[in-house]
Interface confidence: medium
């Protein structure tokens, strides 16, 4: 599956777990494998394109979410979700534009 599809589905499911079930642990369980995939680095041109377009923002979001894990300061999670939402919107626009 393409990275943008995996991230789109993952952010959708993560938002369900957080905003629907209030399940922060489950949210992290969805997002962390996606971040690990990003961390391993791109192996195709499409993955390289994704990494260039969203990698920096997603890494920043991950840093905020990891900070929340240790700080329990809700503002850290707020910052992470601001970025995730922004990326989700961009992926959605790009995805709809090409389909």
């Amino acid at each position: 599956i393409l990275w943008h599809e995996q991230w789109h589905e993952g952010l959708e499911e993560a938002s369900r777990l957080y905003f629907g079930d209030r399940n922060v642990k489950g949210m992290f369980e969805i997002l962390e494998p996606l971040h690990a995939m990003l961390e391993r680095g791109p192996q195709t041109l499409k993955e390289t394109s994704f990494s260039q377009a969203y990698g920096r923002e997603l890494t920043e979001a991950y840093e905020w979410s990891q900070r929340y894990k240790t700080s329990a300061v809700v503002m850290d999670l707020d910052r992470a979700w601001d970025i995730y939402y922004h990326v989700f919107q961009k992926i959605s626009r790009h995805h709809h534009h090409h389909h």
Epitope: L11, E12, S15, R16, F19, G20, D21, R22, V74, M75, L77, D78, W81, D82, Y85, F88, Q89, S92
Partner: antibody, heavy 123, light 107 residues
Framework: EVQLVESGGGLVQPGGSLRLSCAAS????????IHWVRQAPGKGLEWVAS????????SYADSVKGRFTISADTSKNTAYLQMNSLRAEDTAVYYC????????????????WGQGTLVTVSS | DIQMTQSPSSLSASVGDRVTITCRAS??????VAWYQQKPGKAPKLLIY???SLYSGVPSRFSGSRSGTDFTLTISSLQPEDFATYYC?????????FGQGTKVEIK
């Protein structure tokens, strides 16, 4: 067409019980979130309780915790609010609302509401 | 609990006026804020979700914005059917909370 229809409201004495129903149609009820929101006469909106139809996980406002129970019957596409030990301050119009939680759905927000059912607690 | 402080509680305006209603969250709520319109005897209707996204079927004269924990609903040109009460609401944490409401009346 998405529809939510509440029923079960009425006049009840303090300390009494009532069960409200919220019949849903036009969407996949078994994977949805239903919330109850109330509005006292001439006042604002107050969130009461929520349930996930799939996991049955529930949440309650402190003002009703221990007295109200929210449940869902996926075979009937209906959510319920069992209200016990009712007080005068529970007098309100009770709305059930569908909660959408995910960014692609248009959430998190209440996108569809029922027409409301009036509960009056008075002796 | 997160308090949503809405202002003003009421306002008088004329058709064609630009109307702004604000809501301040007592703590961080990300963009998980929605705005609703309610008319007497009716259920609320969703206008804006995720702070600034216009809900399907809602006229484009309605818009929402966010600056930190401050949220704004703007009606660019008030129409006769817009006279109603407006509520903000946060979904960031349980309990979900609403603002006290703003009644928009005819001047």
């Amino acid at each position: 067409e998405v529809q939510l229809v509440e029923s079960g409201g009425g006049l009840v004495q303090p300390g009494g019980s009532l069960r409200l129903s919220c019949a849903a149609s036009g969407f996949n009820f078994s994977s949805s979130y239903i919330h109850w929101v109330r509005q006292a006469p001439g006042k604002g909106l107050e969130w009461v309780a929520s349930i996930s139809s799939s996991s049955s996980s529930t949440s309650y406002a402190d003002s009703v915790k221990g007295r109200f129970t929210i449940s869902a019957d996926t075979s009937k596409n209906t959510a319920y609010l069992q209200m016990n030990s009712l007080r005068a301050e529970d007098t309100a119009v009770y709305y059930c609302a569908r909660y959408v939680y995910s960014y692609s759905q248009g959430g998190p927000a209440f996108d569809y509401w029922g027409q409301g059912t009036l509960v009056t607690v008075s002796s | 609990d997160i308090q949503m402080t809405q202002s003003p509680s009421s306002l008088s305006a004329s058709v064609g006026d630009r109307v702004t209603i604000t809501c301040r969250a007592s703590q961080s709520v990300s963009s998980a804020v929605a705005w609703y319109q309610q008319k007497p005897g009716k259920a609320p209707k969703l206008l804006i979700y995720s702070a600034s996204s216009l809900y399907s079927g809602v006229p484009s004269r309605f818009s929402g914005s966010r600056s930190g924990t401050d949220f704004t609903l703007t009606i660019s040109s008030l129409q006769p059917e817009d006279f109603a009460t407006y509520y903000c609401q946060q979904s960031w944490s349980v309990p979900i909370t609403f603002g006290q409401g703003t009644k928009v009346e005819i001047k």
